[in-house]
């Protein structure tokens, strides 16, 4: 019986051009985490295997950094990064647990202020 639960950062927002840490945490189970897969809709971002290290998908290699821990740091954010992200925990003997994070990438406040105010 699967007793574990995934805690995530839930719905988060970040500024365009900035970075964000995607983090999940598996609790309430003694199951061993063998691997965590990070996905965005149909795309694989990264895999962290407990023993074999990280795999970063080539389409994200220039702006995804592994960690902290089993988390993932997404850099140089664009509006197109808005959407659902999933952390998929492969565990033994429980099986698979999935957590969901919704990221909204906003136009930077600097840009907004720049549009509203003129320098005297």
């Amino acid at each position: 019986m699967m007793t574990g639960t995934i805690e995530t950062t839930g719905n988060i927002s970040a500024e365009k051009g900035g970075s964000i840490i995607l983090q999940c945490h598996l609790s309430s189970t003694t199951a061993q985490v063998t691997q965590v897969n990070w996905e965005q809709q149909d795309q694989l971002l990264a895999i962290c295997n407990a023993d074999l290290g990280w795999h970063i998908s080539p389409s994200f290699k220039d702006r995804v950094a592994p960690g902290p821990g089993l988390g993932l740091t997404l850099q140089s954010l664009t509006v197109n990064d808005t959407g659902e992200y999933f952390c998929i925990y492969h565990t033994y003997p429980d099986g698979t647990y999935t957590g969901r994070i919704f990221l909204e990438v906003l136009e930077s406040s600097v840009a907004e202020h720049g549009a509203r105010f003129q320098i005297p």
Epitope: D42, Q43, L44, I47, G53, S59, H90
Partner: antibody, heavy 119, light 107 residues
């Protein structure tokens, strides 16, 4: 130039053990995971397992747990695979294969070691 | 374990032809798939990964596509030196598994 040089062919008796080596050069040994792959005659490829030379962490295919043991010697930049309680089913070509940087694809392969188990 | 099925064990083609090899995963594997070429008497060689990126030095006649459970490897114009066995492999979850291989024969 990255090279993975495997030990030579082995002819061993059933029930015995064998240790195959994979000596590496041309890169920093501890920075890349090393994997081992089995290819029985005329058949497909099977992943045996992988080892992280930096910390010695291993991941095995359940099918080969108890059959294969993966180790490394950092001082000589060499990976080893020991196979025990050998039977004719273990007769195959065994490859070491190195992954890429933060990539699980097997970018470099050894030349293969042929193991024959026969009485 | 995830089973990778290459439906054709053999494919016969002529020089200059376009050929596609398919690979079906028994479970969802996202884009965690690579393709290898193994010529007679040689070690396998990585051609395509993730599953549409050509490895360094691989000719552009080799392409890959797919996501989820269905993957395709294509040679746009077969050359005599492409005679080999081609394998798909998933690394979405351990144990990482290979397809049974498709042997490309040149007519």
């Amino acid at each position: 130039e990255v090279q993975l040089q495997q030990s030579g062919p082995e002819l061993v008796k059933p029930g015995a053990s064998v240790k195959i080596s994979c000596k590496t050069s041309g890169y920093t040994f501890t920075e890349y995971t090393m994997h081992w792959v089995k290819q029985s005659h005329g058949k497909s490829l099977e992943w045996i397992g992988g080892i992280n030379p930096n910390n010695g962490g291993t991941s095995y295919n359940q099918k080969f747990k108890g059959k294969a043991t993966l180790t490394v010697d950092k001082s000589s930049s060499t990976a080893y695979m020991e196979l025990r309680s050998l039977t004719s089913e273990d007769s195959a070509v065994y490859y070491c294969a190195r992954s890429g940087h933060m990539d699980y694809g097997y970018v470099y392969w050894g030349q293969g070691t042929t193991l024959t188990v026969s009485s | 374990d995830i089973v990778m099925t290459q439906s054709h064990k053999f494919m016969s083609t002529s020089v200059g032809d376009r050929v596609s090899i398919t690979c079906k995963a028994s479970q969802y594997v996202s884009t965690a798939v690579a393709w290898y070429q193994q010529k007679p008497g040689q070690s396998p060689k990585l051609l395509i990964y993730s599953p549409s990126y050509r490895y360094t030095g691989v000719p552009d006649r080799f392409t890959g596509s797919g996501s989820g459970t269905d993957f395709t490897f294509t040679i746009s114009s077969v050359q005599a030196e492409d005679l080999a066995v081609y394998y798909c492999q998933q690394h979405y979850s351990t144990p990482w598994t290979f397809g049974g291989g498709t042997k490309l024969e040149i007519k």
